[in-house]
């Protein structure tokens, strides 16, 4: 169990590096936006993890970002963010088969409505039971 | 533009709570963290904690027992309160634009703890 | 909590030098890093973040450097406005917590 952790965190920590380079394999990625999504976490450790990913960086004083499958729903009525960006970007996520492009990439400001929590535990928990 | 302008007592007697308002303008506090550092004089700057967009908060770790961090949207005000305040307390107290880095800073608000 | 420990804790350079300044942590932060200049009397003011990207308004001169533990700020062509005290801080984790400091003089 303990190799079959540190296997999973090796391929998220992957994941989350390569996030939005290669337009024609986001299979892992979206995999890993619905784990996000369901599980209601963001990152591995945390949600700062992301921010090394340069696709999703803002600008300067702007550049902490995460995907929108980071963003808490249920944390806010900003129905202007809601129909506009995340409700389209999150109704993908029951389409794991459909390619993306990296113009369709959804972010976030990371300082807004998002999960706070790492998936690590979450995960972990999930594999001790199962 | 972005401006931040924090409002303290000044002078605060040991073992009471100290309260500061942060004012807020040109940004959304409901997407952005508010921070609050403080310098004690001629000392390095110490992080106390943030509130985020969505309401929640972190928290130096020494000090969790001792503060609090809320906000007003409508006000466009963030506040923070520390108790049981001792000599060592006595800081320039700072709001900031911000929760990971610190953007915009206010200009800072002096709290000396004396009797 | 992560400490941060930054070096030297002061330095006296001639306008037109090189400088770097380094800031080590106590475990990986993942660049999770900013730089700030705080001016006697004054308020700090945000160089980097993500422990490479330049800040708004910052001039090009300033440049932000590491990754895992070890970071660091290098000023090329030190002008005299770059004088002030140099803090690191990082945002890893739940916690965040600065550098000491570097003072840093003009000669």
């Known amino acids: 169990r303990a190799q079959l952790e540190r296997s999973l965190r090796d391929v998220v920590e992957k994941t989350i590096q390569k996030y939005g380079t290669n337009p024609e394999e986001t299979a892992a990625e979206e995999s890993w936006d619905y784990v996000q999504f369901q599980l209601r976490c963001c990152g591995w450790h945390y949600p700062q993890d992301w921010f090394q990913v340069l696709i999703l960086r803002g600008n300067g004083s702007e550049a902490h970002r995460v995907p929108c499958s980071c963003y808490n729903l249920s944390a806010t009525n900003d129905s202007t963010i809601l129909d506009k960006v995340i409700l389209p970007q999150l109704s993908r996520l029951g389409h794991l088969a459909r390619s993306r492009h990296s113009a369709d990439i959804c972010a976030v400001p990371a300082e807004s409505h998002i999960y706070r929590e790492g998936c690590a535990q979450g995960l972990q928990k999930w594999l001790h039971n199962n | 533009q972005v401006q931040v302008q924090e409002s303290g007592p000044g002078l605060v007697a040991p073992s009471q709570t100290l309260s500061i308002t942060c004012t807020v303008s040109g940004f959304s506090l409901t997407t952005s963290g508010v921070s609050w550092v403080r310098q004690p004089p001629g000392k390095g700057l110490e992080w106390l904690g943030v509130i985020w967009g969505d309401g929640s908060t972190n928290y130096h770790s020494s000090l969790k027992s001792r503060l609090s961090i809320k906000k007003d949207h409508s006000k466009s005000q963030v506040f923070l309160k520390l108790n049981s305040l001792t000599a060592a307390d006595t800081a320039t107290y700072y709001c900031a634009k911000g929760g990971y880095s610190l953007a915009h800073w206010g200009q800072g608000t002096l709290v000396t703890v004396s009797s | 909590d992560i400490q941060m420990t930054q070096s030297p804790s002061s330095l006296s350079v001639s306008v037109g030098e090189r400088v770097t300044i380094t800031c080590r942590a106590s475990?990986?932060?993942?660049?999770?890093l900013a730089w700030y200049q705080q001016k006697p009397g004054k308020s700090p003011k945000l160089l980097v973040n993500v422990a490479t990207n330049l800040a708004d308004g910052v001039p090009s001169r300033f440049s932000g450097s590491g990754s895992g533990t070890d970071y660091s700020l290098k000023i090329n062509s030190l002008q005299p406005e770059d004088f002030g005290t140099y803090y690191c801080?990082?945002?890893?984790?739940?916690?965040?917590?600065f550098g000491q400091g570097t003072k840093l003089e003009i000669k």
């Open positions: 801080q990082h945002y890893w984790g739940t916690t965040w917590t």
């Open positions: 475990e990986n932060i993942r660049s999770n």
